[in-house]
């Protein structure tokens, strides 16, 4: 059987000869050289060589336990002559013994960490870790202890865990933001002779809201022209906050002052400035100076720092309204005037008034915008603003005239304003009523007396206030001995009725009826219209069958004896 124990070998051997490991030996070995010892497995023939006759094993190279702590090899004892193994092939172990040849190495060369400013003493910052490649199961070669070389009195490190904690109260980021801490890890439990490694920990204090906003001045003054429309920025104010990020965010508000309703403040998120803007239209002539109380506050406040005081500040903002040369202002936004259509030229319709709103009260002259009155129907007195006609009017041609009047400061023609004038032309009864259409009707030869053969309608271009009231009658020259009568229906219509039984188209094929239409307005207007009545042959239903076409072709041959 094999005769050996586990082999142990000290690492990092520095001798000049090969390092002796041990001896493989079989009890079958008679010492006569008849056996050959063969080594195979981890490092056989390279790291480990065997004297094939004696079984002595040597290490040819310096071994590093941290690279490989155990080598597993196989041994054979073979009869040189036959190749017959005299023992079963057996596995054996060469265990490399540790020496303290490795210093602790931190997992990072440089650590970065953050901790909130003003943290309590003992607040966790970061944990550093160093590993030692030496054997942790043997001695203290891999027992690491942490200590702080640089960074006191601000930070401390737990010797066993490598946990870095704050060690000083009220560390203020606004005073100092960056700290470089150097931590040492030492093996041998920190004892003399131990190997050590260091790492740098860059610690940044992160901001907390421990500073209120502060205005750099107590009073601000801005000027703005009275013409500034709502929304116009008139000035910027800025409170400073020693904090950063959202802790330095500022909200501005107007809390007091007679300009409370006239101005707004908005916060510019990018610059953290308060922008004072116009809220309502200003008027220098009414108020020349406003004062505002503006407050700057942190929207996010940490309750634990409220003992430091309110996280807001206020400043007074004085706003001076500057006079602007303003255009004249009309007394109305628009004027509506009326005039009768029968007005004579130079009739005054009405007047407009405009005033310079400025303190100077510059005189004003008036004119008509000729683009709005191309036909020059109207004119204006440049001094007093009276509007008058310069041409005759006709309501039936144009009911409304829309013109623009311009008021211009005499001393500064650039300052002008415009106002619309809506002139309504009032109706006058200056048009006679007339037939709504050309009437040409027929009567059957066998018509009976008082038979309605046509209804008449009239139109009138006028537009009387109480509506139209037309009357219809036969013209006086045709009234006696007429074959037809006119019946006024009193509803602005009239009917033509037959006056006898039967008509003979061969005796009289066409009748011309002169009809007088009158209105009842003042002055009364009337006109005469002619209705043509043809005599036709009809069927027993009264449907026309034939008429004399000649009546239409040769009107000169027609009789007028209606």
């Amino acid at each position: 059987s094999w005769m050996w124990n586990q082999f142990f070998l000290l690492e990092e051997y520095t001798g000049s000869d090969y390092q002796y490991v041990g001896k493989l030996h079989s009890d079958q070995d008679r010492g006569d050289g008849s056996l050959k010892y063969i080594l195979s497995g981890d490092g056989a023939g390279d790291l480990f060589i065997i004297n094939e006759n004696t079984g002595d094993i040597q290490a040819t190279k310096r071994l590093d336990r941290e690279e490989k702590p155990v080598y597993i090899l196989r041994a054979q004892a073979i009869n040189r002559r036959t190749g017959r193994p005299v023992e079963p092939e057996s596995e054996f172990i060469i265990k490399i013994h540790d020496i303290n040849d490795n210093e602790p190495i931190f997992t990072k060369e440089v650590y970065t960490a953050t901790v909130p400013e003003m943290s309590d003493v003992g607040t966790f910052v970061v944990q550093v870790t160093a590993t030692d490649a030496d054997d942790p199961t043997y001695g203290n070669s891999a027992k690491v202890v942490y200590s702080i070389l640089q960074g006191q009195p601000y930070f401390s490190v737990e010797s066993e865990t490598g946990i870095i904690k704050t060690a000083l109260l009220n560390m203020d980021r606004e005073n100092r933001e960056q700290y470089q801490v150097v931590i040492q890890a030492k093996d041998m439990g920190g004892q003399m002779g131990g190997l050590s490694g260091t790492t740098t920990v860059n610690i940044t204090l992160t901001d907390v809201n421990d500073n209120p906003p502060r205005f750099p001045q107590s009073t601000y003054q801005f000027k703005t022209p009275e013409s500034s429309p709502p929304g116009t920025p008139i000035g910027r104010i800025k409170a400073s906050d020693a904090d950063v990020g959202e802790n330095a965010e500022i909200e501005y508000s107007i809390t007091d002052g007679e300009g409370l309703d006239m101005f707004d403040v908005i916060t510019d998120q990018e610059t953290q400035e308060g922008i004072i803007t116009v809220k309502k239209l200003l008027d220098f002539e009414k108020k020349k100076v406003y004062t505002l109380k503006v407050e700057a506050s942190n929207p996010y406040v940490e309750p634990r720092f409220l003992y430091l005081g309110p996280f807001k500040d206020s400043a007074t903002v004085r706003i001076v309204v500057e006079d602007v040369d303003e255009p004249p202002v009309f007394s109305k936004l628009a004027y509506i005037l009326q005039i009768r259509e029968d007005a004579q030229i130079n009739t005054t319709i009405g007047s407009v008034t405009a005033q310079d709103p400025d303190a100077a009260r510059n005189p004003v002259k008036y004119s008509v915008d000729r683009h709005t009155d191309m036909d020059r129907i109207f004119n204006i007195d440049s001094g007093n603003g009276s509007i008058f006609t310069s041409k005759l009017l006709d309501r039936e041609t144009l009911l409304w005239h829309n013109i623009t009047v311009i008021a211009t400061e005499i001393n500064n023609p650039k300052q002008s304003s415009r106002v619309p004038l809506y002139i309504k032309v009032l109706d006058v009864n200056d048009n006679a009523p007339e037939f709504a259409e050309f009437y040409e009707t027929f009567v059957c030869e066998k018509a009976k007396a008082d038979q309605l053969i046509q209804t008449l309608h009239a139109v009138d271009k006028d537009d009387p206030y109480s509506g139209h009231q037309f009357s219809f009658s036969l013209a006086p020259e045709a009234a006696s001995g007429s074959n037809f009568t006119i019946q006024d229906n009193k509803d602005n219509t009239a009917g033509i009725l037959t006056r006898k039984n039967g008509y003979n188209r061969h005796e009289m094929s066409t009748y011309l009826l002169p009809v007088v239409i009158s209105d009842n307005d003042y002055p009364v207007q009337s006109s005469t219209g002619t209705v043509t009545v043809r005599v036709c042959a009809c069927d027993h239903h009264g449907n026309m069958q034939s008429c004399h076409a000649e009546a239409l072709i040769h009107p000169t041959g027609l009789s007028t004896g209606a």
Partner: antibody
Framework: EVQLVQSGAEVKKPGSSVKVSCKAS????????MHWVRQAPGQGLEWMGD????????HYTQKFKDRVTLTVDKSTSTAYMELSSLRSEDTAVYYC??????????WGQGTTVTVSS | DIQMTQSPSSLSASVGDRVTITCRAS??????????MHWYQQKPGKPPKLLIY???NLESGVPSRFSGSGSETDFTFTISSLQPEDIATYYC?????????FGGGTKVEIK
């Protein structure tokens, strides 16, 4: 380079003896056993015996035990095989071969021994 | 004595063919996981040449188309792809027990 060089061909009378030499080079002569194998014309291989050059320990096959003698001269790294009482059936090619763990890894070129009256 | 029976005694195969030779020992030639069986090639007029030792180990410088396997009493020698230069007689040999003995040989020819 390992080489085994054998002596030349021999023609012998029945009843006589023959001694074949085998000179080794290219390795440590005393570290390996030397074997002798013969091959009759058209026949297979037949192991005769071997010798340990360091101690001159020998092993013979039963068939040749009384007629074969294996010897070495360490000074010249030469091995010898002597076969006595030759018979016609001893006509064969005789090879020396280096033994290593039961296998023949190097062979001589062979010596033809003819036994004829 | 351990008898070595080799078969076939001769065979003819084409170039590229897989050739298998078996050798049966009359008793086991294995001990402690080592198989004391070796294979040789002999060409006419030349001494034998070691190809495989300890049943399956390829001797240095021998082409990889030659291989061996087996244990105890049954062993196999294989040429994976027969080449023209492989024409020879192949022998098995045991070193387990004196006297060391050879198989009768297998003569390999090309068709």
């Amino acid at each position: 380079e390992v080489q085994l060089v054998q002596s030349g061909a021999e023609v012998k009378k029945p009843g006589s003896s023959v001694k074949v030499s085998c000179k080794a080079s290219g390795y440590t002569f005393t570290n390996y056993w030397m074997h002798w194998v013969r091959q009759a014309p058209g026949q297979g291989l037949e192991w005769m015996g071997d010798i340990d050059p360091s101690h001159s320990e020998t092993h013979y096959t039963q068939k040749f035990k009384d007629r074969v003698t294996l010897t070495v001269d360490k000074s010249t790294s030469t091995a010898y095989m002597e076969l006595s009482s030759l018979r016609s059936e001893d006509t064969a090619v005789y090879y020396c071969a280096r033994g290593d763990l039961g296998r023949f890894d190097y062979w001589g070129q062979g010596t033809t021994v003819t036994v004829s009256s | 004595d351990i008898q070595m029976t080799q078969s076939p005694s001769s065979l003819s195969a084409s170039v590229g063919d897989r050739v298998t030779i078996t050798c049966r020992a009359s008793e086991s030639v294995s001990i402690h996981g080592t198989h004391l069986m070796h294979w040789y090639q002999q060409k006419p007029g030349k001494p034998p040449k070691l190809l495989i030792y300890a049943a399956s180990n390829l001797e240095s410088g021998v082409p990889s188309r030659f291989s061996g396997s087996g244990s105890e009493t049954d062993f196999t020698f294989t040429i994976s792809s027969l080449q023209p230069e492989d024409i020879a007689t192949y022998y098995c040999q045991q070193s387990f027990e004196d006297p060391w003995t050879f198989g009768g040989g297998t003569k390999v020819e090309i068709k």
